[in-house]
């Protein structure tokens, strides 16, 4: 007789997973002399005991611990760039501005990042069908726990002046729902971080509106200055101008507004 | 540096079986997914089938199934490709590479080859 | 044994600009599914040139590009050089056979 099998909503555990995991993680630590030391097998084991085994609706930050204190890395507090619903600009700027970090540029965010997982209760299985959906299913999955655990982690560590990259092209620029604004945006130490500075991306190439003044920036900078924490705000323009001045800092067109 | 290097040059008898090695030197083959990739002389690659040791699995390709054999020993950082039932057209030179993920999820390629290693089928 | 259809060869004199192309099917080029490209110089074994469609391994010259459109997929190769010359192959795993399939494989050659 066939095992029943849960269905979720959500798209199921990405092919490959272990693999995945593992090749990023050998990848990883070839690339980051600092992080040479880490046993990537030990890694994918905490990884695995996260979830395996367990109710995917039932997964909590401490299931994640381990693989935590596999994964603790030192970034520079003060070169840490935040940003919501626009990752591939973040990422491309932090390619070029080797010195900034986001999130997927450390181990763990970079082992998961894309990638969708999880696993059964009372089976050593993992599930390639389906994983819940954090809407229709249930928010304590393990992807969704993993960005929460992950994510506060790097607000906690941030300091000085924060970076974070916003999508101007977004009905709600800033979203109270997005982990940025549930998870991380709390999670700044006043004690440590002086400044937020916000970055907002516009999308149309002749769109000259000041999008500092959108009603959930102002909002954001509420929650914020609540905080204790002083807020700015600037608007990029031109992402493409704003990624080609990033390389060539030097180029005289860079002067100008971007 | 990482680097595979595979055993020496084989003459085999039609009907009899092949064991070529490749050894991890300068990196843990037990983090690695090695595949065995040939090539007949003056034709194309062929992809024959890989194995993931951290996980104990290995696959080959329908065309292989019956006659590849697969397999690693960690504990030597050394990974084998055993193909039995040999005839001429399997005359090639047999490369192992380790296949290492891209820039997205779902995504490989072979990013380090071993230099190949000659096997002639002749009676 | 199902394999993606490479020109046999293309040629072009030094600091021309050549591409080569790769077709393949729904269930390979097609599918959600990426495809490298690798070089083979004479006598020696592959090294890969291009992955993920368009991304460069570092060490690799910016002359060499690649891009995928539906089913197919191309590799470019600008400011064309005598040690250029070699097969050039493209790859990507196939759904429907559950292995990787390669080009028939390219012979450049340098005028």
């Known amino acids: 007789v066939p095992r029943w099998r849960q269905q979720w909503s959500g798209p199921g555990t990405t092919k490959r997973f272990p693999e995945t995991v593992l090749a990023r993680c050998v990848k990883y630590t070839e690339i980051h002399p600092e992080m040479r030391h880490v046993d990537c097998q030990s890694v994918w084991d905490a990884f695995k005991g996260a979830f395996i085994s367990k109710h995917p609706c039932n997964i909590t930050e401490e299931d994640y611990q381990p693989l935590m204190k596999l994964g603790t890395q030192t970034v520079p507090c003060n070169k840490i760039l935040l940003w919501s619903r626009i990752k591939d600009l973040a990422h491309q700027f932090t390619q070029v501005q080797r010195d900034m970090f986001t999130l997927e540029d450390t181990l763990l965010g970079y082992l998961a990042d894309d990638l969708t997982w999880c696993g059964e209760f009372n089976t050593s299985k993992i599930n390639y069908q389906s994983c819940p959906d954090w809407r229709k299913d249930c928010s304590n999955n393990p992807v969704s726990v993993f960005w929460k655990t992950v994510s506060r982690r790097f607000a906690e560590a941030a300091c000085d002046v924060v970076h974070v990259m916003l999508n101007g092209s977004r009905s709600k620029i800033f979203d109270k729902n997005s982990t940025f604004g549930s998870v991380e945006v709390h999670n700044l130490q006043p004690e440590k971080v002086q400044t937020l500075e916000a970055w907002v991306i516009h999308g149309g190439r002749e769109d000259s509106r000041d999008l500092c003044q959108d009603p959930t920036i102002k909002e954001l900078e509420s929650i914020i200055s609540k905080r204790n924490i002083q807020f700015s705000c600037k608007n990029i323009y031109r992402p493409d101008k704003f990624l080609q001045c990033v390389k060539n800092p030097e180029d005289s067109s860079c002067t100008s507004e971007i | 540096q990482v680097q595979l290097v595979q055993s020496g040059a084989e003459v085999k008898k039609p009907g009899s079986s092949v064991k070529v090695s490749c050894k991890s030197s300068g990196g843990t083959l037990r983090n690695y997914v090695i595949n065995w990739v040939r090539q007949a002389p003056g034709q194309g690659l062929e992809w024959m089938g890989r194995?993931?040791?951290?996980?104990?699995?290995?696959e080959s390709a329908q065309k292989f199934q019956n006659r590849v054999t697969i397999t690693a020993d960690t504990s030597i950082n050394t990974a084998y490709m055993e193909l039995s039932s040999l005839r001429s057209e399997d005359t090639a030179v047999y490369y192992c590479?380790?296949?290492?993920?891209?820039?997205?999820?779902?995504?490989?390629?072979?990013?380090?080859w071993g230099r190949g290693t000659l096997v002639t089928v002749s009676s | 044994q199902s394999v993606l259809t490479q020109p046999a060869s293309v040629s072009g004199s030094p600091g021309q600009s050549i591409t080569i192309s790769c077709t393949g099917t729904s269930s390979d080029v097609g599918a959600y599914n990426y495809v490298s490209w690798y070089q083979q110089l004479p006598g020696t074994a592959p090294k890969v040139l291009s992955y993920?469609?368009?991304h460069r391994p570092s060490g690799v010259p910016d002359r060499f590009s690649g891009s995928k459109s539906g089913t197919s997929a191309s590799l470019a190769i600008s400011g064309l050089q005598s040690e250029d010359e070699a097969d050039y192959y493209c790859a990507a795993w196939d759904d429907s056979l559950n292995n990787y399939v390669f080009g028939t494989g390219t012979k450049v050659t340098v005028l």
């Open positions: 993920s469609n368009d």
């Open positions: 590479a380790r296949e290492t993920v891209g820039a997205t999820a779902a995504d490989w390629y072979f990013d380090l």
């Open positions: 194995i993931t040791p951290f996980l104990g699995e290995s």
